[in-house]
């Protein structure tokens, strides 16, 4: 019988008492084969973290700073359940740390040196750790003691709880630096009052502070937020302009064998029976013998943290950067106005080799990071392990939902000013063999399908979106008899036609021979009935243009396109016979790297782009013999986006809506994780 006990870690006598009460009350409402609670008492949260890592306990609830400690080796804990606040309909699991300024003050985030600052309190998250952590590398050296460096950075501050004797500048705006509400500038409201009264130029608070202190929109409009990209936004746009997004209070468990499903089962049942307004005799979110025992008293319930989400992703790049800077105190030697090498994310072995060659030729301007799947690459860009990659539109959508931004678009048509003119897109098509003359768009059921990969535009999102509208369910593996859609579950019929060997079967990378445009077309040639690809795929792989044995004798005339009206047309008539227009592939990055990725890539394409005529003896960025490694092989240049610089603007309303509809069918664990952070 599996052990269904969750050993909860308590850090005080009062917590241990509440834990025992929790245990006893759960026993009374949960059947004997259900989850149960046991209590383990430790002296501190850090001791609880160590106990969970050592398998002496299973769970504890922590604030963000401790979630970071719990994640660090050797603890390796992960978030599994989040407390939420507010209503069940609009649950808040995060708050945003923001920098508020007066509207007419005219400076940006990178111009804070010499300004006057208002903090909620020394060592507090939104008021000190996050802003000072993010500004850490701009502080004057020596950066230790930190208070002295901060005092020398700003021209005056109010940082309640600071030592006014040793660091008088930190108490200049609030004499005495009192560490309670007796100091009018203490806490969130106090720090905002410090700004409002004109004592300070910037207040470091959380997003709700402004709304709690100014009920009137006209009053709020006198203030703005400083964004990390050195712009400003209105105070209600905090989701797009903050210093960090911080989880409020989180249950952590071991990453391996951590009982996360059992912990969720326990807490989900606990909130049903003992949550807000559920029971008089025991309340989960109430602490008669103290404050915030086991859980925050202000919590309204629990939400399961998506399994794909590790602590780094949960805490977010900005928060992790800030806390790491404060803890480790290390700053890059390079001057901050100089671009560091761009870390390109390469998928599997073949892309890594091409990337390495690029790295050598770029003389270190490009560095390479490997991942096995596109989603793993996106996650690495999110957390700073990588910086950029070029993505199909379907993944631009996921990357956008994860906070990344498009920076340059692949262009596929030669034109005089290629780099200045991003194209409208390419055509997603359905290709069949001419010999299968009875096959149309209307009788694909039961046929064998070939897809570039799950989640990609021409190979999946567009055809499956159209199909979903017809069949109204997500069981595409039942609609087709079999197929190859790399990235599908291994036991799915949509992996049956794939050709990868062993663990590489159906993997969404080049180790699977039927992956990508060329792979999906090869799947059609060798096994399938229909391939969902781009309009250039057939001409690029026929007429001897692809020298591979499977492709070298193919003739374009032997293939036709399926039109949505039930007719068929020759391959060259794609403009009048396609499934939809697809947005071109685009390079994505984090917002903080946008300018440098743009600058370095434009330099790189001038050196190694389409202007290189002899690719046999020189490195060519956009060539890999039909394998589409790093970029599509038909890329002519990378073009500026002008104002299409968010994923919604880049992909266009129609495509975003189409992918949004298909999200009901999404198997993307990354998309699930990212929409948890930003619904």
């Amino acid at each position: 019988v599996p052990d269904k006990t969750v050993r909860w870690c308590a850090v005080s006598e009062h917590e241990a008492t509440k834990c025992q009460s929790f245990r006893d009350h759960m026993k009374s409402v949960i059947p004997s084969d259900g989850p149960s609670v046991a209590c383990v008492k430790k002296a501190s949260y850090l001791d609880c973290i160590r106990a969970i890592a050592a398998n002496e306990a299973d769970a504890v609830t922590l604030d963000a700073g401790l979630v970071y400690d719990a994640y660090l080796a050797p603890n390796n804990l992960k978030p599994v359940v989040a407390e939420f606040y507010g209503s069940k309909e609009d649950p808040q699991t995060f708050y945003y740390a923001v920098a508020v300024v007066k509207k007419d003050s005219g400076f940006q985030m990178n111009q804070l040196r010499g300004k006057k600052s208002c903090h909620t309190g020394l060592g507090r998250s939104a008021g000190w750790n996050i802003p000072i952590g993010l500004l850490y590398c701009d502080l004057p050296e020596p950066r230790k003691p930190l208070e002295k460096a901060v005092a020398n950075f700003f021209s005056g501050s109010c940082a309640p709880c600071a030592d006014g004797t040793d660091f008088p500048q930190l108490c200049q705006l609030c004499p005495g630096c009192g560490c309670s509400t007796l100091n009018q500038y203490f806490g969130y409201s106090g720090a905002f009052k410090c700004l409002k009264d004109g004592a300070g130029d910037v207040a470091f608070v959380k997003h709700s502070t402004i709304f709690e202190n100014l009920a009137n929109k006209a009053d709020r409009d006198q203030y703005e937020l400083l964004c990390l990209d050195n712009t400003r936004k209105p105070v209600d746009e905090y989701k797009d302009c903050h210093l960090a997004q911080v989880p409020s209070h989180t249950v952590v468990a071991r990453s391996m064998g951590g009982k996360e499903d059992l912990i969720w089962e326990l807490l989900n049942q606990a909130q049903e029976h003992f949550g807000k307004d559920k029971s008089k005799e025991f309340q989960l979110f109430s602490s008669p013998h103290g404050k915030d025992l086991l859980f925050k008293d202000s919590a309204h319930g629990f939400l399961k943290v998506p399994p794909r989400m590790d602590a780094k992703m949960y805490l977010g790049y900005e928060y992790v950067t800030a806390i790491r800077n404060l803890r480790e105190g290390t700053c890059p030697e390079a001057p901050t106005d100089e671009c560091k090498p761009v870390k390109w994310c390469a998928l599997s072995h073949h892309e890594r080799l091409k990337c390495d060659e690029w790295s050598v030729n770029s003389v270190g301007k490009i560095e390479c990071v490997s991942a096995e799947t596109t989603e793993d690459c996106i996650a690495k860009i999110m957390n700073g392990e990588a910086d950029a990659m070029s993505l199909d539109g379907g993944f631009v959508y996921i990357a956008g939902k994860c906070g990344l931004v498009p920076v340059l678009a692949e262009n596929y048509n030669k034109s005089d000013n290629c780099e200045d003119t991003p194209e409208a897109g390419y055509f997603a098509i359905a290709v069949v063999k001419k010999s299968a003359s009875d096959l149309t768009w209307d009788n694909l059921k039961g046929k064998k399908s070939c897809h570039t990969a799950v989640g990609r535009t021409a190979g999946w999102n567009i055809p499956m979106g159209l199909l979903y509208n017809k069949i109204n369910h997500c069981r595409f593996d039942e609609f087709f008899s079999e197929g190859c859609a790399p990235g599908s579950k291994k036991d799915s019929s949509l992996c049956k036609l794939c050709m990868g060997s062993g663990l590489n079967l159906c993997e969404p990378n080049n180790k699977e021979g039927y992956y990508g445009y060329t792979g999906a077309f090869r799947c059609l040639v060798e096994k399938g009935d229909v391939a969902f690809v781009k309009h250039q795929t057939v001409p690029q792989n026929t007429g001897g243009k692809n020298p591979d044995p499977w492709a070298k004798n193919l003739n374009e005339k032997d293939y036709e396109l399926l039109c949505l009206d039930g007719t068929r047309k020759p391959v060259e008539e794609y403009a009048n016979c396609h499934l939809a227009r697809a947005p071109n592939h685009a390079v994505v990055t984090r917002k903080d790297k946008e300018a440098c990725v743009h600058k370095i890539l434009r330099q790189q394409q001038h050196l190694f782009g389409s202007n290189v005529t002899d690719c046999s003896g020189n490195f060519c960025l956009f060539r890999s013999e039909t394998k589409d490694l790093l970029f599509r092989d038909d890329t002519v240049c990378l073009a500026k986006l002008h104002d299409r610089n968010t994923y919604e603007k880049y992909l266009g309303e129609e495509y975003v809506k189409a992918v949004g509809n298909l999200r009901k069918c999404s198997t993307s664990s990354l998309l699930e994780a990212c929409t948890f952070r930003r619904p």
């Epitope: 073949h350 060659e357 050598v360 003896g617 490195f619 890999s624």
Partner: nanobody, 117 residues
Amino acid sequence: QVQLVESGGGLVQPGGSLRLSCAASGSIFSINTMGWYRQAPGKQRELVAGITRGGTTNYANSVKGRFTISRDNAKNTVYLQMNSLKPEDTAVYYCTDYSSRYYHDYWGQGTQVTVSS
């Protein structure tokens, strides 16, 4: 297809030096960039140093200042001079060319370098 043969590995004490050679034969006219990789037991293969036909070089941070890559185009050979060797440099060293736009799956047999006292 280009054939590559690595040599020059061996056992050396920490602080010592070795010079690896890689001779290329086959359709070498198309070789532009060449690289030395290494793979330690249980680790991923990693690029150590690379050199273009024009002599532009690039190194992994862990070997900068200690290793030097060079090539003799007339002899179709690429070299890796390894100085101040450390125990963590122990690995099988492979040389590769990037002549094929297929970014091949084939590698030479490699040459074992062991740094130990």
